[in-house]
Every structure is written in structure tokens, then in C-alpha cells.
């Protein structure tokens, strides 16, 4: 895990401010308004029956 | 480091009550998605209950098997995870087992707590 | 409910030795981008441990002969060349939609 600043996080995740390190963009789909989101590429919102079965 | 430690378990009558305890650390609890699972002695693994966050209003998701029998509850002020089992079966006698995520992949694991149902 | 089909539920192998366990899903738990299964560990009396999230991201401090892949319904994990302290219980696991299902394990043991 990279610290801002030094080397972009690997491919297919993101930086959080939030919990200082990378986060995987895959859990977006998930969890949409965390913060690393904005810099995946494509997060799609999670579906309806997801959040809440 | 993360630890996750469970206690709480313990020898139950069929029918009775027991109340399961998670002390977590070394991560942002408050952050985080948790649930219990359990291992039946000799089996595989089962989903048992989850609990979101704050933001999620304390969003709660239970498997059928213990739905209206089973309650997951948390306080973030005290990093501790909740399982309030009623109704016990000789079926839920299992290791219980404390997980932490922040979505989908269980990162986190306590070590267990046996529950054992019977009379 | 998604059911998760593990195969094979045990094997005997040697050190050394390629190992590919099978899990297939009873639906897609996969998007266009990422797909929604993951792998732990086990050893006998101790917790599961994460190995692999999103089908083939390999979690911090996993050894890299540990290997994942598949995407739709079916996936598969693999220890290129197994060691004694691969000698364990391995479990597949979907996040697609509540309720969260397993696989029902596939034991390693030493042949």
C-alpha cells in the first residue's frame, strides 16, 4: 500500500483518505460514496436488492 | 495489528439464550461492515448475520436459518460486535466466529467461540 | 440463494505439486469489471484466513503461488507448487447478494 504522494495505487484500486491506504475499486459497487470511488474509473452504484436484500 | 476476540460461548439447554461478544482493535471499527459466521464441528463455513454502519442505520441482514431467533447488534463507542442468540437448536451448536470488512471479502477473524446446544 | 459448488471436496497431493480447486456459482457474480468471489484458508482449529478477494486479487502478505481466476459462474483456485503449510481446508465465497454463501471446502492433504 502506497502513501500519498509516492507511487498511484495499484491497478484496480484507489487511495482512501479516509482509512489511509488503497482500496479496492470492486467494493464500490457496494459501498458508492466512500471516498476512494472518485478515483476509480467506472463505479458502478451498487444494485438495490445489495443494500438492501 | 487487527485482532477480533470473541467470548461469550459456553454449554446451553435447547431453548435457552446465550449472548455472544466481539472486542475489536487495530482497525477503524466504525468503518467497517462485520458479521458473524459459524462452523458446525466437522463442516464447512455459514453466514450467519450482518450489521452496516451508522450511515446504514445500523442496516441489519440475518440467514433464514436464524432470522427472528438471532440478533446482530454493535456499538462503535466501544469497538464491540453483538450476537444475541434465543431459541437455541442443538443445530446452532458451532464455533461463531467475528468477521470485519469493508465490503465483500471477510478481511478479518477472531478465533472463535464454541456454542454448544444441549440438553 | 446462490449455491456454491466446490470441487474437489478433498485431494492428496505432494510438495511440489500444481493444485487447482474448482468452484462454480449458481448464477453470475460477476459484473463487466470485477467479479464477486473470493478464497480463504483454513487449518485445523484456527480461523479462516483471506486469500484472494475479487476472483484474482491476492491479499496482502499471500504468498504468490497462490492464484486466482474465473469470471461468470465459475472460478478457480491455484497453489503452483504446494508447500507444507498449504496443507489445509480451502473455501470459496460470494458477495454478490445477501445471504453471503461458501463453498463446502476442499481439503488438502499430504499424499
Known amino acids: 500500500e502506497q502513501a500519498p504522494g509516492t507511487a498511484p495505487c495499484s491497478r484496480g484500486s484507489s487511495w482512501s483518505a479516509d482509512l489511509d491506504k488503497c482500496m479496492d475499486c470492486a467494493s464500490c459497487r457496494a459501498r458508492p460514496h466512500s471516498d476512494f470511488c472518485q478515483g476509480c474509473a467506472a463505479a458502478p452504484p451498487a444494485p438495490f436488492r445489495l443494500l438492501w436484500p | 495489528q487487527v485482532e477480533l476476540v470473541e467470548s461469550g460461548g459456553g454449554l446451553v439447554q435447547p431453548g435457552g439464550s446465550l449472548r455472544l461478544s466481539c472486542a475489536a482493535s487495530?482497525?477503524?471499527?466504525?468503518?467497517?461492515?462485520m458479521s458473524w459466521v459459524r462452523q458446525a464441528p466437522g463442516k464447512g463455513l455459514e453466514w450467519v448475520a450482518e450489521?452496516?454502519?451508522?450511515?446504514?442505520?445500523?442496516?441489519?441482514h440475518y440467514a433464514e436459518s436464524v432470522k427472528g431467533r438471532f440478533t446482530i447488534s454493535r456499538d462503535d463507542s466501544k469497538n464491540s460486535l453483538y450476537l444475541q442468540m434465543n431459541s437455541l437448536r442443538a443445530e446452532d451448536t458451532a464455533v461463531y466466529y467475528c468477521?470485519?470488512?469493508?465490503?465483500?471479502?471477510?478481511?478479518?477473524w477472531g478465533q472463535g467461540t464454541l456454542v454448544t446446544v444441549s440438553s | 440463494d446462490i449455491q456454491m459448488t466446490q470441487s474437489p471436496s478433498s485431494l492428496s497431493a505432494s510438495v511440489g505439486d500444481r493444485v487447482t480447486i474448482t468452484c462454480r456459482a449458481s448464477?453470475?457474480?460477476?459484473?463487466?469489471?470485477?467479479?464477486?468471489m473470493h478464497w480463504y484458508q483454513q487449518k485445523p482449529g484456527k480461523a479462516p484466513k483471506l486469500l484472494i478477494k475479487?476472483?484474482?486479487n491476492l491479499e496482502s502478505g499471500v504468498p504468490s503461488r497462490f492464484s486466482g481466476s474465473g469470471s461468470g459462474t465459475d472460478f478457480t483456485l491455484t497453489i503452483s507448487s504446494l508447500q507444507p503449510e498449504d496443507f489445509a481446508t480451502y473455501y470459496c465465497?460470494?458477495?454478490?447478494?445477501?445471504?453471503?454463501?461458501f463453498g463446502g471446502g476442499t481439503k488438502v492433504e499430504i499424499k
Open positions: 468477521t470485519g470488512y469493508y465490503a465483500d471479502a471477510m478481511d478479518y
Open positions: 487495530g482497525f477503524t471499527f466504525s468503518s467497517y461492515w
Open positions: 450489521i452496516r454502519l451508522k450511515s446504514d442505520n445500523y442496516a441489519t
Open positions: 448464477q453470475s457474480v460477476s459484473t463487466s469489471s470485477y467479479s464477486y
Open positions: 475479487y476472483a484474482s
Open positions: 465465497q460470494h458477495s454478490w447478494e445477501i445471504p453471503y454463501t
